[in-house]
C-alpha cells in the first residue's frame, strides 16, 4: 500500500522565544527517498529542514531518523520568531535524479504569541 | 455556550435529494473546522464529512463520495449537506460536530436531525 | 483506513462497581484517541482527548489510559447516570475519521 505521511496536529501555538514540535510520522519507509520539511505550498515554499547531511540552525529532528525502523520525523523549532509563523509540511519524496514528491502531510499551522 | 442546531431531516425516498443545515453560535464559527456525523438506528456512529473554516479543506467517507456535498456560509455561521440520489442505507441520525481546535476529535455536538429514507 | 474494536459489546454492571472498557486499533494511533458517551435519545459527548486528559466538566471517576493500539476507559464507582453507550475514535490519520463499533454499559 501506498506510504501515508501523518501529521496529527492541525495547529499548534507557541510564544516568540520557545520551542515547538511538529509531529510527523510515516506509515512506510518505501519507497527510498528523503523527508524534507516545508513552510508554505507551491513554487515559494520554503525548505525548513530534511532528513540528510544538511546543518539547519534552531531546527532539530526529534528521535534518530537513522534507525532502520524508525518512522517518526518530527521535528522541533528552536528560538521560534513571528516570522516562523505559517502551514508547515512533512513530504516524503522518491529517489531519483531529480527525487520525486509522492506524499505530503496534511499541514500543521504554527501561531506565534508574543511573549 | 456553544450552540449547534440541526434542521432539514425527514422522511424520503430514495433516489431523492435533501439538504440538512446546522446552524452555530457561541464560537467564532469561521475558525473551526466542523464535520457531519451520522449514526444509523441502534447502530454506532459514522464520520460522513469534514469541511474546513475556510472551506478550502473537504473530505468525504467513501459511502457518501459523489452523492453528498458539504459546504458553509461563514457570514451566516451556517453548515450544510446536500445529500442526493438518497439510498436506504442513509437512514440515520444526522449531527454537525465541531472539531477541537487543535485535533479531529469533536467537543461540541448538535441534537441531531433525523433523515429516513423510505419508499 | 485505522479500525477500531470495542469490547466488550455488552457490560453488565451494578452501581458502585468498576466498568473497564477497551479498545484496540488496528495500527498504532499513538495517544490520539478520544472516549465519548452517549445516552438515548441525545448526542454523544466528549469524556477524554489524548487517550487521558477529561474533557471540561467530566468528573474524575473517569479515567483514560493506553497508547499505541490498546486503549482503556475506566469508570472507578459507576452512577445511575454513567449508564449509556460508550465510543471511542482516533485522531491520529487524516480522514476518513474512524468510531470504535461502541460498548453498552447497562445495569445488571
Known amino acids: 500500500t501506498e506510504v501515508k505521511v501523518i501529521q496529527p496536529e492541525k495547529s499548534v501555538s507557541v510564544a516568540a522565544g520557545d520551542s515547538t514540535v511538529l509531529n510527523c510520522t510515516l506509515t512506510s519507509l518505501l519507497p527510498v527517498g528523503p523527508i524534507r520539511w516545508y513552510r508554505g505550498v507551491g513554487q515559494s515554499r520554503q525548505l525548513i529542514y530534511s532528513f540528510t547531511t544538511e546543518h539547519f540552525p534552531r531546527v532539530t529532528n526529534v528521535s534518530d531518523a537513522t534507525k532502520r525502523s524508525n518512522l517518526d520525523f518530527s521535528i522541533r523549532i528552536s528560538n521560534v520568531t513571528p516570522e516562523d509563523a505559517g502551514t508547515y509540511y512533512c513530504v516524503k519524496f522518491q529517489r531519483g535524479s531529480p527525487d520525486t514528491e509522492i506524499q505530503s502531510g496534511g499541514g500543521t499551522e504554527v501561531y506565534v504569541l508574543a511573549k | 455556550e456553544v450552540q449547534l442546531v440541526e434542521s432539514g431531516g425527514g422522511v424520503v425516498q430514495p433516489g431523492r435529494s435533501l439538504r440538512l443545515s446546522c446552524a452555530a453560535s457561541?464560537?467564532?464559527?469561521?475558525?473551526?473546522?466542523v464535520n457531519w456525523v451520522r449514526q444509523a438506528p441502534g447502530k454506532g456512529l459514522e464520520w460522513v464529512s469534514l469541511?474546513?473554516?475556510?472551506?478550502?479543506?473537504?473530505y468525504y467517507a467513501d459511502s457518501v463520495k459523489g452523492r453528498f456535498t458539504i459546504s458553509r456560509d461563514n457570514s451566516k455561521n451556517t453548515l450544510y449537506l446536500q445529500m442526493n440520489s438518497l439510498r436506504a442505507e442513509d437512514t440515520a441520525v444526522y449531527y454537525c460536530?465541531?472539531?477541537?481546535?487543535?485535533?479531529?476529535?469533536?467537543?461540541?455536538w448538535g441534537q441531531g436531525t433525523l433523515v429516513t429514507v423510505s419508499s | 483506513e485505522i479500525v477500531l474494536t470495542q469490547s466488550p459489546g455488552t457490560l453488565s454492571l451494578s452501581p458502585g462497581e468498576r466498568a473497564t472498557l477497551t479498545c484496540r486499533a488496528s495500527?498504532?494511533?499513538?495517544?490520539?484517541l478520544a472516549w465519548y458517551q452517549q445516552k438515548p435519545g441525545q448526542a454523544p459527548r466528549l469524556l477524554i482527548y489524548?487517550?487521558?486528559s477529561r474533557a471540561t466538566g467530566i468528573p474524575d471517576r473517569f479515567s483514560g489510559s493506553g497508547s499505541g493500539t490498546e486503549f482503556t476507559l475506566t469508570i472507578s464507582s459507576l452512577q445511575s447516570e454513567d449508564f449509556a453507550v460508550y465510543y471511542c475514535?482516533?485522531?491520529?490519520?487524516?480522514?476518513?475519521?474512524?468510531f470504535g463499533g461502541g460498548t453498552k454499559v447497562e445495569i445488571k
Open positions: 460536530a465541531k472539531e477541537n481546535n487543535r485535533y479531529r476529535f469533536f467537543d461540541d
Open positions: 457561541g464560537f467564532t464559527f469561521s475558525s473551526y473546522d
Open positions: 469541511i474546513s473554516g475556510s472551506g478550502e479543506i473537504i
Open positions: 495500527q498504532s494511533v499513538y495517544t490520539y
Open positions: 489524548g487517550a487521558s
Open positions: 475514535q482516533q485522531y491520529y490519520d487524516r480522514p476518513p475519521l474512524t
